[in-house]
């Protein structure tokens, strides 16, 4: 089907970059500028994404791709493909509506985004607190009491390059 | 693309243990907090817990505490959901869901959920 | 702890619109998301953030929150749209979910 198809429709040779051309006799002409079509056969090119504002450009708009945005410093990305900027917060804070607010005694935020999560409960996971928490950290959980015998030593292990809620940009 | 995929169904003796597995694919698994969600017949949503799959920190539902264990293994990019001392009023669909990044914390990817039965 | 009031059921004429509400106590000062739940299915994320759409869910769903109400609107319903919707909050250490709506399209 889709060789007949191809056969019957001349815009399926318009390749990416052009737009199947109604006035001119179904001929493939270059998208116009700030527009673009990332798929071969279509009628129309899209607009550019522009990046204004609080956005700013990532990647310039080509005839074949949109634009990308991220955000100015001070912000993060929320949704897909960046569709909207975010205020950061400081770690050991969270985002409200009314702006920035201090996560309250037995909560942590170890990032710039995000909500103020309680500190997890060791012993429900039948652990011990080996570090505890503060505004800006999880407590870490340690073996339980009773594995800790004599001599042994418990290590802190090194911070992770990335929490949950950073999503690669 | 984005997936989670659970174990099997389940059917349990009441009293028993039940662990359900959610793999996740096409992230970064550790970059995201993963919840637990049940759903009994008929009703509504549930939520269980959260695991943060990079240090193991976790956060359960009052309601589950002391019966709910949420655990992690990163080199399978897997979290497990175990329930214990079961009942028939633990029958229920239980669903991993991956945490997005809205203000306000939002389940932004579901798994296809796990039917556990308690029956004797 | 923190509680979220839906109304049982809602029904609607196709092409019409449909409002879901969601009731908590100040809620308009939360972040309320919104799922969809078909029979046999996982719930879809269809609104977060109160009234911000994620890609792939049509332009007919929005959503809106202030005071004691926060509402998902859904503008002319298609059969498609027949579904469980529940409304979702963060509160200080749990997530919790309203009861759900069934919303039937006549």
């Known amino acids: 089907f889709e060789r007949t198809r191809s056969l019957q429709d001349p815009c399926s040779n318009c390749p990416a970059g052009t737009f199947c051309d109604n006035n001119r006799n179904q001929i493939c002409s270059p998208c116009p500028p700030n527009s673009f079509s990332s798929a071969g056969g279509q009628r129309t090119c899209d607009i550019c994404r522009q990046c204004k504002g609080v956005f700013r450009t990532r990647k310039e708009c080509s005839s074949t791709s949109n634009a990308e945005c991220d955000c100015t410093p001070g912000f993060h990305c929320l949704g897909a493909g960046c569709s909207m900027c975010e205020q950061d917060c400081k770690q050991g804070q969270e985002l409200t509506k009314k702006g920035c607010k201090d996560c309250c005694f037995g909560t942590f935020n170890d990032q710039k985004r995000g909500i103020c999560r309680p500190w997890t409960n060791c012993s429900l996971d039948g652990k011990s607190v080996l570090v505890n928490g503060t505004k800006e950290r999880d407590v870490v959980c340690g073996p339980s009491p009773a594995d800790l015998s004599p001599g042994a030593s418990s290590v802190t292990p090194p911070a992770p390059a990335r929490e949950p809620g950073h999503s690669p940009q | 693309q984005m997936q989670l995929v659970q174990s099997g169904a389940e059917v349990k003796k009441p009293g028993a243990s039940v662990k359900v597995s959610c793999k996740a694919s096409g992230y970064t698994f550790t970059g995201y907090y993963m919840h637990w969600v049940r759903q009994a017949p008929g009703q509504g949503l549930e939520w269980m817990g959260w695991i943060n799959p990079n240090s193991g920190g976790t956060n359960y539902a009052q309601k589950f505490q002391g019966r709910v264990t949420i655990t992690r293994d990163t080199s399978a990019s897997t979290a497990y959901m175990e329930l214990s001392s079961l009942r028939s009023e633990d029958t229920a669909v239980y669903y991993c869901?991956?945490?997005?990044?809205?203000?306000?914390?939002?389940?932004?990817?579901w798994g296809q959920g796990t039917l556990v039965t308690v029956s004797s | 702890s923190y509680e979220l009031t839906q109304p049982p059921s809602v029904s609607v004429a196709p092409g019409k619109t449909a409002r879901i509400t969601c009731g908590g106590n100040n809620i308009g000062s939360k972040s309320v998301h919104w799922y969809q739940q078909k029979p046999g299915q996982a719930p879809v994320l269809v609104i977060y953030?109160?009234?911000d759409r994620p890609s792939g869910i049509p332009e007919r769903f929005s959503g809106s929150n202030s005071g004691n109400t926060a509402t998902l609107t859904i503008s002319r319903v298609e059969a498609g749209d027949e579904a469980d919707y529940y409304c979702q909050v963060w509160d200080s250490s749990s997530v919790v979910f309203g009861g759900g709506t069934q919303l039937t399209v006549l």
């Open positions: 953030y109160d009234s």
């Open positions: 869901a991956r945490e997005g990044e809205a203000v306000g914390l939002d389940l932004d990817y």
